[in-house]
Interface confidence: medium
C-alpha cells in the first residue's frame, strides 16, 4: 500500500540503487517514486553532514522485503516510494530554495527581475531542467539578477552548495505549464536523428512516447516496430536529444514511428503509467513472483499491488492454467521496461499501474459566509483541489468554495446550503482559476447527493460541514487532484504553514475576485480565539486562524473553501471556510470547521453513500 | 431541431386566471432552467420567473409575486403559468426561453399574446 | 434591482456604417452581460453572451466589449438585415434586468 510517512533522524541501511543531489527529502522522494526500483530513500540535509560530498544527498534504494534497517543519524530524513499513492504521484516541483546554488550545466544566462521569472524561463525553455537565480543583494554585483538556466545528464543538480543570495528550483514543464506547447503527432515509417539518451525495449510507441516525457533529458524518439527488418532492434524505444531541443533530420524508414516528447504539453501531461494490455505478447524480466489468478485483468491488479512488480505476463498455457486460473508472471528488471518482449504467444502481457495517479475512487485521507483579503493571485495548479460551488437559476453565481477530497466527493460548508438545498441548481467548476474563463462549453460537475451535518443548524456556526457527492467522477490531473484530510483527531501536529484560499470578497464590502486567491496565515489557540469571541462558543471542533492586527483573512464566497496546511511536504485539509466577524478585522481571526473532529462522519457518508468502501489510507 | 412552442394566451377580464403552457422538443428538457419573459406592446422585455430543473426551485419578478405561478412537468416536456389576479399591466407576448450553458436565453418560443381588458 | 440604461434610444443608419450602441449598468456587473436582436413581430435572438463572446452563428460584424458598468454592442459594417431592436440584459443578479432597448432604423 501506499506509505506516506517519513522518518526523522533515520537513514535506511543499504539497498542502494542509485543516488543523486536533491534540494530536499521532498524532492529526493519524488526520484525515488519515478524511479523504476526505489522503494525507500535517505536524504542527508546540509546541516546533517560535515562531508561537504555527501551534503544534499539523495539515496535511493531497493529491498526485497520493503523495508531496510534503520540507523539514527542526526538530521537525515527518510521515507518510502510514492508509488501505489495515485493523485499523490506527479514529478511536478513548484518550491524554490533560498541560499542554494544548485549546479550543472549552464547553458543560458540572461538578466531578470525576480526568481519567478527564472522559473518561468526556465519552463518555457526546452533544454532547461534547473535554474539559480542571483538576487539584487549577490556579492559580486556583475552577476546579480542573473538567471542561469542548467541541465545534467540525470536532471538531478551535479552538486548543491550553500550560497547566500541565490535561489534555485526546477522547471514547471513537469506541472503542465510550459508555454511551448507539444507536438501529439506519431509520424509513421520514419526515424529521426541525433544523441540516443537512453534505449528499452516497449511493446508500441505510446509506452516509448510516454517514458520519453517522463525521461530527464529524451526530447523525442523513435521506435523501431516488431516487424522491423533487423531481429536483435525489434521493438527497441530509442530516447534522444540534441543541442536545438528538435530533430537535426529525419528518415524514411519502414517499420519505424518517430515523435516528441509530452512533456512541454500545457495543462494536461499523460499518466506516468501504461494500462494498456496486449494480447498474445510475452514480457520477459527478472521473476519476483508467480500466482494463479483468474483472468488478466486480475493479474494486472496483482502486478499493480505488489509494489516491487513493474510488469507481467498471463499466461493460456493448457500447461500453465488449473480450473478457471491461470499462471500470472509477475516480473522487474533494472530500467522498468521488458528485458525481452514477444510475439504470437499464448500469453498477454502489461504494466504494473502502481504509477496512475488516478487511484482508486476514493477519499485521500492520511494516518499519521466568507474573497480572500490582503492576499496573492494564485497559479495554476497550486491548489488543485479547490473548486467553485455555482448556482444557476436567473444568473450564474460563484457562493461558496470548496474542497475536493476524492473522485466524486466534495467537502464544503453546511451553510452554503442555507435556501438552496437543491442539487439541480449548483454547478460545480473545478480544475479552474480564474472565474472569468468560464464559458458556457467549460465542463462542471452536478450534484448527485448533498449530505449536510445532522447537527448543523441554520445561523449557528457549529458542525459547518458538508459533503457533495459528485453525479460522476472527476479524473485527477496537474490542475485537479484531491486534498488528503488529517487523521482522526488529530491535535499533535504543529501546523506552521497554512493557507487560506478562495474567490471571495478582498474586503467587506466587495465583490467576487476573477483569480483565485491566496493567504498565508497562522494558526490561533482555541483560547486565544475565545477571547476574541465572546458572545460565541468556540468549541473544539472548530480551528481559528489570523493576524493579531488583521489585515489577512477569508470573506464573503470564501466560505465551505479549505484552510491547508503543509507538513512534511504535504498538504493536508485542516479547516473549512465558516464564519467571522468581518474580514481581517484586527483581532478578530476567522473560524473555520475543524475536519480532524469530524473524519468517522466523513467516513462514515463516503462509504455507506454507496456501500463500498471509499476511503484510501496511503499510510 | 431545439423548439418552444407557448399556448394558453387570449383575452380576459382583469381579475381572471390564464394558464399558459410551453412545449419544448429536441433537447432535453429535464436538465434545463426554464424561464417566462413578457414584451407589453410597443415596450421592452421584462423577466417574469424562473424555474430549476426538476421545478424544486422558483423565483418570481416583485410585479407578479403571489399572483403567478410557475411549474414543469419533466415526463411531458412542458413549462406552465398560471396566472391569477390579472391586471391590465400584465397585457403582453409572454415567451418561454431557456438559458444556455451561462446566462443568455439563446432559445426563445414565437410568444404568446395575453390581453386583460374589461 | 439593477437598472440597465441604453443609449441612444433610436437612432438611423446607412447600409454599410459603423453603429455603436452603449448600455450601462447601476453597478459592477462583472461581464455578465448579454446582447439581443429584436426584428418586429419575432422571439429575441441572443448575439453576444458574458460581455464579447459572440454566439455560434452569429457574423462576425457583431462584437461587444466592455466589464463593470459600461458595455458596448459595435455592428462594423451596417447590412439590411440588421435594422431591428437591440437589447442589453444582466444576469449578473437576480432579477435579470433588460436594457429598454436601441431601435436601429434605415436612414
Known amino acids: 500500500g501506499c506509505l506516506t510517512q517519513l522518518y526523522e533522524n533515520a537513514f535506511f541501511r543499504g539497498g542502494d540503487v542509485a543516488s543523486m543531489y536533491t534540494p530536499n527529502a521532498q524532492y529526493c522522494q519524488m526520484r525515488c517514486t519515478f524511479h523504476p526500483r526505489c522503494l525507500l530513500f535517505s536524504f542527508l540535509p546540509a546541516s546533517s553532514i560535515n562531508d561537504m560530498e555527501k551534503r544534499f544527498g539523495c539515496f535511493l534504494k531497493d529491498s526485497v522485503t520493503g523495508t531496510l534497517p534503520k540507523v539514527h543519524r542526526t538530521g537525515a530524513v527518510s521515507g518510502h516510494s510514492l508509488k501505489q499513492c495515485g493523485h499523490q504521484i506527479s514529478a511536478c516541483h513548484r518550491d524554490i530554495y533560498k541560499g542554494v546554488d544548485m549546479r550543472g550545466v549552464n547553458f543560458n544566462v540572461s538578466k531578470v527581475s525576480s526568481v519567478e521569472e527564472c522559473q518561468k524561463r526556465c519552463t518555457s525553455n526546452i533544454r532547461c531542467q534547473f535554474f539559480s537565480y542571483a538576487t539584487q543583494t549577490f556579492h559580486k554585483a556583475e552577476y546579480r539578477n542573473n538567471c542561469l538556466l542548467k541541465y545534467s545528464p540525470g536532471g538531478t543538480p551535479t552538486a548543491i552548495k550553500v550560497l547566500s543570495n541565490v535561489e534555485s528550483g526546477f522547471s514547471l514543464k513537469p506541472c503542465a505549464l510550459s508555454e511551448i506547447g507539444c507536438h501529439m503527432n506519431i509520424f509513421q515509417h520514419l526515424a529521426f536523428s541525433d544523441v540516443d539518451v537512453a534505449r528499452v525495449l516497449t511493446p508500441d510507441a505510446f509506452v516509448c512516447r510516454t517514458i520519453c516525457t517522463y525521461h530527464p533529458n529524451c526530447l523525442f524518439f523513435t521506435f523501431y516496430t516488431n516487424v522491423w527488418k533487423i531481429e536483435s532492434q525489434r521493438n527497441v524505444c530509442l530516447l534522444k536529444t540534441s543541442e536545438s531541443g528538435t530533430p537535426s533530420s529525419s528518415t524514411p524508414q519502414e517499420n519505424t514511428i518517430s515523435g516528441y516528447s509530452l512533456l512541454t504539453c500545457k495543462r494536461t501531461l499523460p499518466e506516468p503509467c501504461h494500462s494498456k494490455i496486449y494480447p498474445g505478447v510475452d514480457f520477459g524480466g527478472e521473476e519476483l513472483n508467480v500466482t494463479f489468478v483468474k483472468g488478466v485483468n486480475v493479474c494486472q491488479e496483482t502486478c499493480t499491488k505488489m509494489i516491487r512488480c513493474q510488469f507481467f505476463t498471463y499466461s493460456l498455457l493448457p500447461e500453465d492454467c488449473k480450473e478457471e486460473k491461470c499462471k500470472c508472471f509477475l516480473r522487474l528488471s533494472m530500467d522498468g521496461s521488458p528485458t525481452r518482449i514477444a510475439y504470437g504467444t499464448q500469453g498477454s502481457s502489461g504494466y504494473s499501474l502502481r504509477l496512475c495517479n488516478t487511484g482508486d475512487n476514493s477519499v485521500c485521507t492520511t494516518k499519521t459566509s466568507t474573497r480572500i483579503v490582503g492576499g496573492t493571485n494564485s497559479s495554476w495548479g497550486e491548489w488543485p483541489w479547490q473548486v467553485s460551488l455555482q448556482v444557476k437559476l436567473t444568473a450564474q453565481r460563484h457562493l461558496c468554495g470548496g474542497s475536493l477530497i476524492g473522485h466524486q466527493w466534495v467537502l464544503t460548508a453546511a451553510h452554503c446550503f442555507d435556501g438552496l438545498p437543491l442539487q439541480d441548481v449548483w454547478r460545480i467548476y473545478s480544475g479552474i482559476l480564474n472565474l472569468s474563463d468560464i464559458t458556457k462549453d467549460t465542463p462542471f460537475s452536478q450534484i448527485k447527493e448533498i449530505i449536510i451535518h445532522q447537527n448543523y443548524k441554520v445561523s449557528e456556526g457549529n458542525h459547518d460541514i458538508a459533503l457533495i457527492k459528485l453525479q460522476a467522477p472527476l479524473n485527477y490531473t496537474e490542475f485537479q487532484k484531491p486534498i488528503c484530510l488529517p487523521s482522526k483527531g488529530d491535535t499533535s501536529t504543529i501546523y506552521t504553514n497554512c493557507w487560506v484560499t478562495g474567490w471571495g470578497f478582498s474586503k467587506e464590502k466587495g465583490e467576487i475576485q476573477n483569480i483565485l486567491q491566496k493567504v498565508n496565515i497562522p494558526l490561533v489557540t482555541n483560547e486565544e480565539c475565545q477571547k476574541r469571541y465572546q458572545d460565541y462558543k468556540i468549541t473544539q471542533r472548530m480551528v481559528c486562524a489570523g493576524y493579531k492586527e488583521g489585515g489577512k483573512d477569508a470573506c464573503k464566497g470564501d466560505s465551505g473553501g479549505p484552510l491547508v496546511c503543509k507538513h512534511n511536504g504535504m498538504w493536508r485539509l485542516v479547516g473549512i471556510t465558516s464564519w467571522g466577524e468581518g474580514c481581517a478585522r484586527r483581532e478578530q481571526p476567522g473560524v473555520y470547521t475543524k475536519v480532524a473532529e469530524y473524519m468517522d462522519w466523513i467516513l462514515e457518508k463516503t462509504q455507506s453513500s454507496d456501500g463500498k468502501a471509499q476511503m484510501q489510507s496511503p499510510a | 431541431e431545439v423548439q418552444l412552442l407557448e399556448s394558453g394566451g387570449g383575452l380576459v377580464q382583469p381579475g381572471g386566471s390564464l394558464r399558459l403552457s410551453c412545449a419544448a422538443s429536441?433537447?432535453?428538457?429535464?436538465?434545463?432552467?426554464m424561464h417566462w419573459v413578457r414584451q407589453a406592446p410597443g415596450k421592452g422585455l421584462e423577466w417574469v420567473s424562473g424555474?430549476?430543473?426538476?421545478?424544486?426551485?422558483?423565483q418570481y419578478a416583485d410585479s407578479v409575486k403571489g399572483r403567478f405561478t410557475i411549474s414543469r412537468d419533466n415526463s411531458k416536456n412542458t413549462l406552465y403559468l398560471q396566472m391569477n389576479s390579472l391586471r391590465a399591466e400584465d397585457t403582453a407576448v409572454y415567451y418561454c426561453?431557456?438559458?444556455?450553458?451561462?446566462?443568455?436565453?439563446?432559445?426563445w418560443g414565437q410568444g404568446t399574446m395575453v390581453t386583460v381588458s374589461s | 434591482d439593477i437598472q440597465m440604461t441604453q443609449s441612444p434610444s433610436s437612432l438611423s443608419a446607412s447600409v454599410g456604417d459603423r453603429v455603436t450602441i452603449t448600455c450601462r449598468a447601476s453597478?459592477?456587473?462583472?461581464?455578465?452581460l448579454n446582447w439581443y436582436q429584436q426584428k418586429p413581430g419575432k422571439a429575441p435572438k441572443v448575439l453576444i453572451h458574458?460581455?464579447?463572446t459572440l454566439e455560434s452563428g452569429v457574423p462576425s460584424r457583431f462584437s461587444g466589449s466592455g466589464s463593470g458598468t459600461d458595455f458596448t454592442l459595435t455592428i462594423s459594417s451596417l447590412q439590411p438585415e440588421d435594422f431591428a431592436t437591440y437589447y442589453c440584459?444582466?444576469?449578473?443578479?437576480?432579477?435579470?434586468?433588460f436594457g429598454q432597448g436601441t431601435k436601429v432604423e434605415i436612414k
Open positions: 426561453a431557456r438559458p444556455g450553458g451561462l446566462d443568455a436565453f439563446d432559445i
Open positions: 429536441g433537447f432535453t428538457f429535464s436538465v434545463y432552467l
Open positions: 424555474i430549476s430543473p426538476s421545478g424544486g426551485y422558483t
Open positions: 453597478q459592477s456587473i462583472n461581464t455578465y
Open positions: 458574458a460581455a464579447s
Open positions: 440584459q444582466q444576469s449578473y443578479s437576480t432579477p435579470p434586468t
